[in-house]
């Protein structure tokens, strides 16, 4: 059959027609529509938006659009009993209280149902005690406190600045250190870029602005009460004491005006070095406790939030494939927001909406993709990636057999400097080739390709003339597809200049000030960066769904596997004596990587030469490509993290947002010098090398000639 059997226009024209149909003005309109009221997960407003999107996707021309609902554990503040933190004197009187809400932005003063800042899933409690400042509350920060500075956090309330790592890791670290409460705050050093005004006059965080967010440590479990299975009507739910990933100590976020009041009184030790100092006019003393005249004062937390099983709704749209309807390419992003969601998620949802509209337009003209495209508007992402994970749990058997790729579509922008891509190595060549065909939206790059501006502004640290592409971590809805199911995944957005802007994320992240006006006035007035992101995300989906041979290059996996093996070997070689003592060898891993490289090379040669008009051989070769990512899945999962099953990549155990390579070996080696039983610890290193070597070898064999 001809290569364009699914369509009445030539393949090249298809992509051009699809891309030409994408309009910045539409994205702008959709963003405005999605951001006028809050769309908190589990609320009526978000259910109404789900129904609106369902209706519009049907109008756009999708074959079917369904709502998929689940009853999951969510968390909300108590409306009549607000959360706050106080400084109390020796008589127990509250002499200072933190604010109960963010001052609303201009034009939004009369909006109801703005959830006040809170840490989702915090338990209730009113702990009081001395304060310890723990910097970013990273693993290394607690090592510094406990091992170097000899400061014991047990029984203390810790105050940590947001940034660098996922907030859930901060809370986990504080719990392990014995803290009885955690205060999270946004320091201007991380959330106030120099030379830029505070919202509403600029894109910086005002002193009363606060970052909301969940503080779970789910490790990919989804709904805390139904790990591994969908939270459907007949679900068996765990008791709250057995729920996955819930914090055990009260946690609350504050802005930097309130943080100043707490930090200015800190006594105890000076900060260990400049990396512990933020930008407030305080000494950043670590504590414990307050200084001098204030030494009898304590900090008290008042947390009254509740966890509630609540219904959530995903919107799932289908555009049936004409040739391979049983092969799924998925484009998904979340719909729920903390407040208005001006950037997170609606800048992404608006792009998805426009991509759906463009695909629908082509379909109405008689075109169909070769493979089925699924579009998803996920719910409850902010509460732990719940909507996407529950849906994937419900459909796991279909997905593991039919899932070709997943493209994530959360926030389209976190800056307006250059492109940022994280994806499986299988997609490197797809991303390179696509961005070479797209126009750069950047000033000074008129008439140049996106690839050129991206490479210039964000060069690869390893390969000259190529752009940086990062490892997938987590903290977004691709997690279940990639880390649990082994479906090739990628994400793309416009980002800031990481070299000049050292703040974490974007300043107004998860605050009430994340509005439509923030985007329209300060980030992307022409919506040209949104359009570019739509072209990248949409273009990737188009190619994945429509190319005759899947646009995956297994040789790129071989290259990174060698790089990752070299890296983990060099980490282990910091302990040469122990490696000798316990006979630790990486030979099996390097041998497996070598075999993978040779087999991938031969497979790529066959891919060039085979008869593409033979549908059986074509399907066979495509299946080998599709199932390669799946081959890196270990059904037993990583130690203590059963839902992180990818052997090559997992979210870092110290920062959910970051990806770690050969995570099993990495975690076994981490802090190994402090382990009480070195023989056992090095035995686990050897076991993890064995698992990794076996998995790489097994994956290589899936690319061998089938007979």
């Amino acid at each position: 059959k001809s290569s364009n059997e699914a369509t009445n226009i030539t393949p090249k024209h298809n992509m051009k027609a699809f891309l030409d149909e994408l309009k910045a003005e539409n994205i702008k309109k959709f963003l405005y529509n999605f951001t006028q009221i809050p769309h908190l997960a589990g609320t009526e407003q978000n259910f109404q938006l789900a129904k609106q999107i369902q209706s519009q996707w049907k109008e756009f021309g999708l074959d079917s659009v369904e709502l998929a609902h689940y009853d999951v554990l969510l968390s909300y503040p108590n409306k009549t009993h607000p959360n706050y933190i106080s400084i109390i004197n020796e008589d127990g009187n509250e002499i200072f209280n933190t604010s109960l809400f963010e001052p609303p932005p201009p034009g939004y003063e009369n909006v109801s149902d703005i959830v006040p800042p809170f840490s989702a899933f915090s338990p209730q409690g009113m702990p009081e005690g001395d304060l310890v400042y723990v910097n970013y509350a990273r693993t290394e920060d607690f090592f510094k406190l406990e091992r170097d500075m000899k400061i014991n956090c047990s029984g203390k309330i810790v105050i940590a600045r947001y940034g660098k790592v996922f907030r859930g890791n901060k809370v986990k670290n504080a719990q392990l250190a014995g803290a009885k409460g955690v205060i999270l705050y946004s320091d201007p050093a991380d959330y106030f870029a120099p030379g830029v005004k505070s919202y509403p006059d600029g894109w910086n965080l005002p002193g009363g602005g606060v970052q909301r967010g969940n503080i779970l440590n789910l490790n990919g479990a989804g709904d805390p009460l139904t790990p591994g299975y969908p939270a459907n009507e007949y679900a068996y739910r765990r008791g709250i004491a057995e729920a996955v990933g819930l914090p055990s100590i009260p946690v609350h976020p504050i802005g930097y005006y309130d943080a100043q009041k707490l930090l200015e009184k800190m006594g105890g030790s000076a900060p260990p070095d400049s990396s512990w100092r933020g930008s407030l006019k305080v000494p950043y003393n670590v504590g414990p406790g307050f200084t001098g005249n204030f030494s009898t004062q304590k900090v008290k937390m008042h947390i009254h939030s509740t966890n509630e099983v609540t219904r959530i709704y995903n919107v799932i749209g289908t555009l049936r494939g004409a040739v391979e309807p049983d092969r799924y390419v998925i484009l998904g992003g979340h719909r729920d927001s903390w407040v208005f969601g001006g950037i997170d998620p609606q800048s992404g949802a608006a792009v998805v909406h426009e991509i759906v509209r463009s695909f629908g337009t082509l379909k109405k003209e008689g075109w169909r993709p070769r493979r089925t495209i699924l579009f998803a508007s996920w719910d409850a992402e902010e509460f732990g990636l719940l909507g996407s994970t529950e849906w994937a749990e419900e459909n796991s058997r279909l997905l593991q057999e039919r899932g070709v790729a997943y493209i994530n579509a959360d926030s389209s922008i976190e800056g307006n400097y250059t492109l940022r891509v994280d994806c499986t190595p299988l997609m490197y060549s797809l991303v390179h080739n696509l961005t070479k065909e797209l126009k750069s939206p950047d000033e000074g790059f008129e008439g140049k390709s996106l690839y050129e501006s991206w490479t210039k502004k964000s060069p690869s640290p390893e390969f000259s003339g190529m752009p940086r592409i990062s490892k997938l971590g987590s903290g977004n809805d691709f997690e279940v597809f990639f880390q649990r199911l082994g479906i090739a995944s990628g994400r793309a957005r416009y980002t800031k200049n990481w070299e000049t802007n050292k703040f974490s994320g974007y300043p107004l992240y998860h605050s009430v000030y994340e509005t439509y006006e923030l985007v329209e006035k300060f980030y992307d007035p022409m919506f040209k960066y949104h359009l570019t992101v739509a072209q990248v995300r949409g273009g990737m989906v188009f190619e994945l769904a429509n190319s005759i041979v899947l646009p995956f290059d297994c040789r790129d996996y071989a290259v990174v596997l060698r790089k990752y093996a070299d890296k983990i070997y060099s980490i282990s070689m910091k302990h040469p004596q122990e490696m000798k003592t316990y006979s630790v060898s990486f030979d099996s891993l390097f041998s497996a990587v070598k075999n993978f490289t040779e087999i991938a090379s031969k497979f790529s040669e066959r891919l060039q030469d085979f008869d593409k008009s033979n549908p059986i051989v074509l399907r066979m070769m495509n299946d080998q490509l599709m199932f390669l990512e799946r081959a890196f899945i270990d059904p037993l999962g990583l130690p203590d993290r059963p839902f992180y099953r990818h052997v090559i990549y997992a979210p870092s155990s110290h920062n959910k947002y970051a990806g770690e390579s050969f995570p099993g070996i990495y975690d076994a080696l981490f802090d190994i010098e402090s382990k009480v039983d070195p023989s056992k610890a090095w035995g686990e290193v050897k076991r993890q090398i064995y698992v990794a070597a076996f998995t790489v070898q097994a994956a290589a064999e899936t690319l061998s000639e089938v007979a």
């Epitope: 510094k144 170097d148 000899k150 006594g267 260990p272 070095d273 200084t291």
Partner: antibody
Amino acid sequence: EVQLVQSGAEVKKPGASVKVSCKTSGYTFTEYTIHWVRQAPGQSLEWMGNINPNNGGTTYNQKFQGRVTITVDKSTSTAYMELSSLRSEDTAVYYCAAGWNFDYWGQGTLVTVSS
Amino acid sequence: DIVMTQSPDSLAVSLGERATLSCRASQDVGTAVDWYQQKPDQSPKLLIYWASTRHTGVPDRFTGSGSGTDFTLTISSLQAEDVAVYFCKQYNSYPLTFGAGTKVEIK
């Protein structure tokens, strides 16, 4: 056993610079703060600055007005202290110390500044 | 800068007797005080941190106490090997500052 071994004695002319090294062993280098302290003949101890070997974060004593630079080389577990624009009053024994509380000390390096 | 004032400048104590060394901070430093021992032609050694916690391997005849501005190092029963100069240091604020030292001798 934790050890800090410093480079040998130096004689410098006024206006010159000196760079003293401190090679550590017996512990995880990135875990402990490295401080530099000096002691003029017959005098007390004077803190010059410190570094977090994990991320290179430094704090200096303002008294040295940008004359001091502290660095580390993680690959060799070595810390360095460079003092520029030397004057005669910089003649002292310079110590490195590991640990926030100066838990472990080097043997000291005598720097003599003389024309 | 916080000034650490040690007294006395020197102290002569009989073997087996108690030696009490004083250190006063010019402002409140909480308990962020260390004590060091320096023997002739040697590097200093950490004795006490957080005003009262003995460093690993330090004999229990050395005791630190105090908080705020007044701190004391006590050697409960002076031994010959305790002859040295003892320095206090504050680490409550930068720059970290040492006292001028107290010289302990045998009477």
